[in-house]
């Protein structure tokens, strides 16, 4: 008597955040007895696509040759073995950047900050937006933050960091988005280099409450709700 088929693993390469026009490959991994793989996209007719497994049969490839708004969204995959269909995979959120003009990222009072002091990163957009995201580059699991003001349209968002430690140093970019689609982001801002000087060390800095920190790929997204002034959206940023 076979147990329930384990849910497949779903991921995207080169990552789940893709610039408009770039290619992306979605992979679904199951077992050696998989005979077919199915990819479903939320709010699209199911199945969105079907593929035969690649040798040695435990995964399938779904190709998107050129990223557009239509491909952005939430995906799950399944595989079929002789005993039936598997459970659905955990969701994959495919995000497209380049949907809106790039915001401006700056540091207040300065991108040169002494360890132990405070700094605020300010993300500003030309047109009003309701979602702003901040990422730190070149980390294994870069931080991703969101700030949402009751869905109100804003031209900027502030990301306070206090107290600053050497861990905060690095290159940041921000994005802006409209709440009706968290899968469509602006072009990235120009990079901002945050330079931390001094020797005060705190290996586990805690961002202030308006900043939500992603722990890694196991995090599931928490969508902002109107009742929470500063609600966090957590995603693994590839």
């Amino acid at each position: 008597q076979a147990g329930p088929l384990p849910k497949p693993t779903l991921w995207a390469e080169p990552g789940s955040v893709i610039s408009w026009g770039n290619s992306v490959t979605i992979w679904c991994q199951g077992t050696l007895e998989a005979r077919e793989y199915r990819l479903d996209k939320e709010e699209s007719p199911a199945p969105w696509d079907r593929q035969n497994p690649l040798e040695p049969k435990n995964k399938a490839r779904f190709s998107i040759p050129s990223m557009t708004e239509d491909y952005a969204g939430r995906y799950r995959c399944y595989y079929r073995s002789p005993v039936g269909w598997s459970q659905p995979s955990d969701p994959l959120e495919l995000v497209m950047t380049g949907a809106y003009s790039k915001p401006t990222l700056s540091a207040l009072p300065s991108p040169l900050v002494t360890s132990g002091k405070s700094v605020t990163l300010l993300c500003q957009s030309r047109s009003p937006m309701d979602t702003f995201l901040l990422i730190k580059e070149r980390a294994a699991h870069p931080l991703l933050h969101l700030r949402s003001e009751h869905g109100a349209q804003q031209h900027q968002a502030e990301f306070p960091m206090s107290p600053v430690t050497s861990v905060h140093g690095g290159t940041y970019r921000c994005f802006s988005s409209h709440g009706f689609s968290h899968y469509l982001l602006s072009h990235p801002s120009d990079p901002l280099e945050l330079i931390v000087s001094g020797s005060l060390e705190d290996p586990r800095p805690s961002p202030t409450r308006s900043v939500s920190t992603a722990a890694g790929p196991e995090d599931q997204p928490l969508m902002p709700t109107g009742s929470v002034p500063h609600s966090g959206l957590r995603r693994h940023w590839e």
Epitope: G3, P4, P6, T9, E13, W27, L32, E33, P56
Partner: antibody, heavy 116, light 107 residues
């Protein structure tokens, strides 16, 4: 907690036979592909055999094909490796692993020594 | 059979350093390349699967990259407990094969 415990390793003469077992717990054994990998005295890792979740498909490298047989008893949550016509180069620490794309869980190993 | 060549054979690093370990395949693997760490008297443990996919419970300082024939395991800011032998393994075609390993020593 996923746990894999190998047993059955022993000192055996060239040409002899041995059957290894791997007791699995902490996951739905019958739903996962399983493998055996061995580590030689020189610390090299060599894949030995793989069996699909229901036991319908088995895979071997040429070095053990026809001499080793991988099997499983899903009712007992146990994986087996029947080894015959053993050679000195089969001397190794034998591990069983759960195969989920990659070998994501390994047992502690059981030592097989082939020597006259 | 696909041959995996790992380099360097041995690497001696100081805690806090970042290191890159290489695994080169004799033919293209797409992304079917996995990384394991083995400490003395312990079983191997999976660090990265499918070239870049992180594994639950593995510290985020371990990351993987590459596709085709060239793959890299990077350890950002090595810690003292990161010593051991690191193996790559391919699952692109039978027979599955392993590299000979890179030994990481902590100075």
């Amino acid at each position: 907690e996923v746990k894999l415990v190998e047993s059955g390793g022993d000192l055996v003469k060239p040409g002899g036979s041995l059957k290894l077992s791997c007791a699995a717990s902490g996951f739905a054994f019958s739903s996962y592909d399983m493998s055996w990998v061995r580590q030689t005295p020189e610390k090299r890792l060599e894949w030995v055999a793989t069996i699909s979740s229901s036991g319908s498909y088995t895979y071997y490298p040429d070095s053990v094909k026809g001499r080793f047989t991988i099997s499983r008893d899903n009712a007992r949550n146990t994986l087996y490796l029947q080894m015959s016509s053993l050679r000195s180069e089969d001397t190794a620490l034998y591990y069983c692993e759960r195969l989920w794309g990659a070998m994501d869980y390994w047992g502690q190993g059981t030592l097989v020594t082939v020597s006259s | 059979d696909i041959v995996l060549t790992q380099s360097p054979a041995t690497l001696s690093v100081t805690p806090g350093d970042s290191v890159s370990l290489s695994c080169r395949a004799s033919q293209g693997l797409t992304n079917d390349l996995h990384w394991y760490q083995q400490k003395p008297h312990e079983s191997p443990r999976l660090l990265i699967k499918y070239a870049s996919q992180s594994i639950s419970g593995i510290p985020s300082r371990f990351s993987g990259s590459g596709s085709g024939t060239d793959f890299t395991l990077t350890i950002n800011s090595v810690e003292t407990e990161d010593f051991g032998v690191f193996f790559c393994q391919q699952s692109n075609s039978w027979p599955f094969t392993f590299g000979a390993g890179t030994k990481l020593e902590i100075k």
